[in-house]
């Protein structure tokens, strides 16, 4: 911590400007009024302060707002955000999506830090649910965000938000997460016609039950093997050879290349050899 020392004559800061970069740490502490700093936070980012100087500025804000910074200050933190600890952030009440975007921009291009994770958690909890605009924003900055949530957290995602999800946002989701997301996607896209529906639902099918796969098999969807490989094993096992053939369409030939891999291997093992032979692929049950 910086010692309390009187501000030298003529050095009292009237505004936050570039002259302050020449101040020693103790001079910043003594000569910059915390209230002035709070009202002119937007200027801080334009000034090339050292990390040590930023520590002093943070300390001043901490003293002014021991219960947590107001949103008017948070929105303009800029690079000072990188100095915040998760404990600091837990004191905040961030409600504006613009504030969230401003802070995510500071961390852009980096992995999700504990600070960012805490910020997002505070923001989402404050909103009560992960609405479409928030999800749009978060997945734009962190494509893996959705899959970093627990199944319990995903349950608060309203079906309307599913429209914001892109296929790549689901790349790292595990089966338990897709089990939660699939019913929401089914509800969100229920009014679309067959082919359009399949395009939208495809990324979520890792959470689909057998009956939905059977229904899709009647719609000439031509599911690709990559999607089939992500289906739940328990959903695939009851499908008949005829249903899998209809589900995959021309892609059925791809089963041969995947015959040693799950869930294809498990499905083959449970089919009658006579039925498998009808595919003409040389699959051995």
């Amino acid at each position: 911590e910086v010692e309390k020392t009187a501000c030298p004559s003529g050095k009292k800061a009237r505004e936050i400007d570039e002259s302050l970069i020449f101040y020693k740490k103790w001079e910043l502490e003594a000569c910059v009024d915390a209230a002035l700093l709070a009202t002119q936070m937007d200027r801080v980012n334009a000034i090339p302060f050292t990390y040590e100087q930023l520590d002093v500025l943070k300390h001043k804000l901490d003293e002014l707002y021991p219960q947590g910074y107001p949103e008017s200050v948070i929105q303009h933190l800029g690079y000072l955000f990188l100095k915040m600890s998760p404990e600091d952030i837990r004191k905040w009440n961030v409600t504006s999506l613009e504030t969230l975007k401003a802070l995510l921009e500071v961390n852009k291009g980096h992995e999700m830090s504990p600070q960012v994770a805490t910020l997002i958690d505070r923001f989402v909890k404050g909103r009560g649910q992960l609405d479409k605009d928030t999800l749009d924003t978060l997945t734009a900055f962190y494509p893996g965000y959705l899959c970093s949530l627990s199944p319990e957290e995903l349950s608060s995602v309203p079906p309307s938000s599913i429209w914001a999800v892109r296929p790549q946002d689901l790349d790292t989701c595990d089966p338990r997460q897709l089990d939660v997301l699939y019913p929401k996607a089914r509800l969100a896209f229920q009014n679309m016609n067959g082919s359009e529906y399949f395009v939208k639902i495809q990324s979520f099918l890792g959470g689909a039950p057998t009956e939905d796969l059977k229904a899709l098999s009647q719609q000439n969807v031509s599911m690709d093997l990559a999607t089939f490989m992500k289906l739940r094993t328990d959903a695939v096992l009851p499908l008949t050879v005829a249903e899998v053939q209809k589900l995959l369409g021309p892609h059925v030939e791809g089963l041969k290349a995947e015959e040693r891999h799950r869930p294809v291997r498990d499905w083959i093992l449970r089919q009658r050899q006579d039925d498998l032979d009808t595919l003409g692929l040389g699959l051995q049950g």
């Epitope: 595990d174 089966p175 338990r176 094993t233 040693r260 799950r262 291997r265 093992l269």
Partner: antibody, heavy 119, light 107 residues
């Protein structure tokens, strides 16, 4: 609940065939969702999967052991068996039988039986 | 065969510590990754299946994560009964393979 019990000789001579049987109790070897595996663990070393069998008789073996392994099933006795031919000292290990439940993993194991290959 | 590489091969930790063990597959195995615990003279015990699902009866301090090639087993607060050897195992490919094991010892 399902339990597994290995049985067979604890000592086998080099070049002979190791034979073990696993008896399934509290459930059926003909379970739709299960395959039945043999796994071994040499003293002080890690686990090595040997192969599995489905009640239909379909088998799948570890490629490194395939030429010497036969796994069979007897649904009437609720048992499955392992035969490993042309054994050497390198086959000395604790041999486990295990159930591979298709929706999870090796969720039920026998207690294991130590087999020593020595003349 | 798909190679499974575990790290570290051993670690020393104290009761209450958070312990993380990693497992890397030589190619993508989707979420078909299981974790086992083995104590001396005993058969292995299934802890986590499908990368992140907790096996029935296993304490919630155990958790798993990952997909594709990189996986993690975490023990949030190590208990005396957790000192054991832990193995990962892939079941994606028909030739099942185990990791080399991680021995968790008392510091």
């Amino acid at each position: 609940q399902v339990q597994l019990q290995e049985s067979g000789p604890g000592l086998v001579k080099p070049s002979e065939t190791l034979s073990l049987t696993c008896t399934v109790s509290g459930g059926s070897v003909s379970s739709y969702y299960s395959t039945w595996s043999w796994i071994r663990q040499p003293p002080g070393k890690g686990l090595e999967w040997i192969g599995y069998i489905y009640y239909s008789g379909s088998t799948n073996y570890n490629p490194s052991l395939k030429s010497r392994v036969t796994i069979s099933v007897d649904t009437s006795k609720n048992q499955f068996s392992l035969k490993l031919s042309s054994v050497t000292a390198a086959d000395t290990a604790v041999y486990y039988c295990a159930r591979d439940f298709v929706l999870s993993g090796f969720d039920i194991w026998g207690q294991g039986t130590m087999v020593t290959v020595s003349s | 065969d798909i190679q499974m590489t575990q790290s570290p091969s051993s670690l020393s930790a104290s009761v209450g510590d958070r312990v993380t063990i990693t497992c890397r597959a030589s190619q993508s195995i989707s979420s078909y990754l299981n974790w086992y615990q083995q104590k001396p003279g005993k058969a292995p015990k299934l802890l986590i299946y499908a990368a992140s699902s907790l096996q029935s009866g296993v304490p919630s301090r155990f958790s798993g994560s990952g997909s594709g090639t990189d996986f993690t087993l975490t023990i949030s607060s190590l208990q005396p009964e957790d000192f054991a050897t832990y193995y990962c195992q892939q079941s994606y490919d028909a030739s099942y393979t185990f990791g080399g094991g991680t021995k968790v010892e008392i510091k």
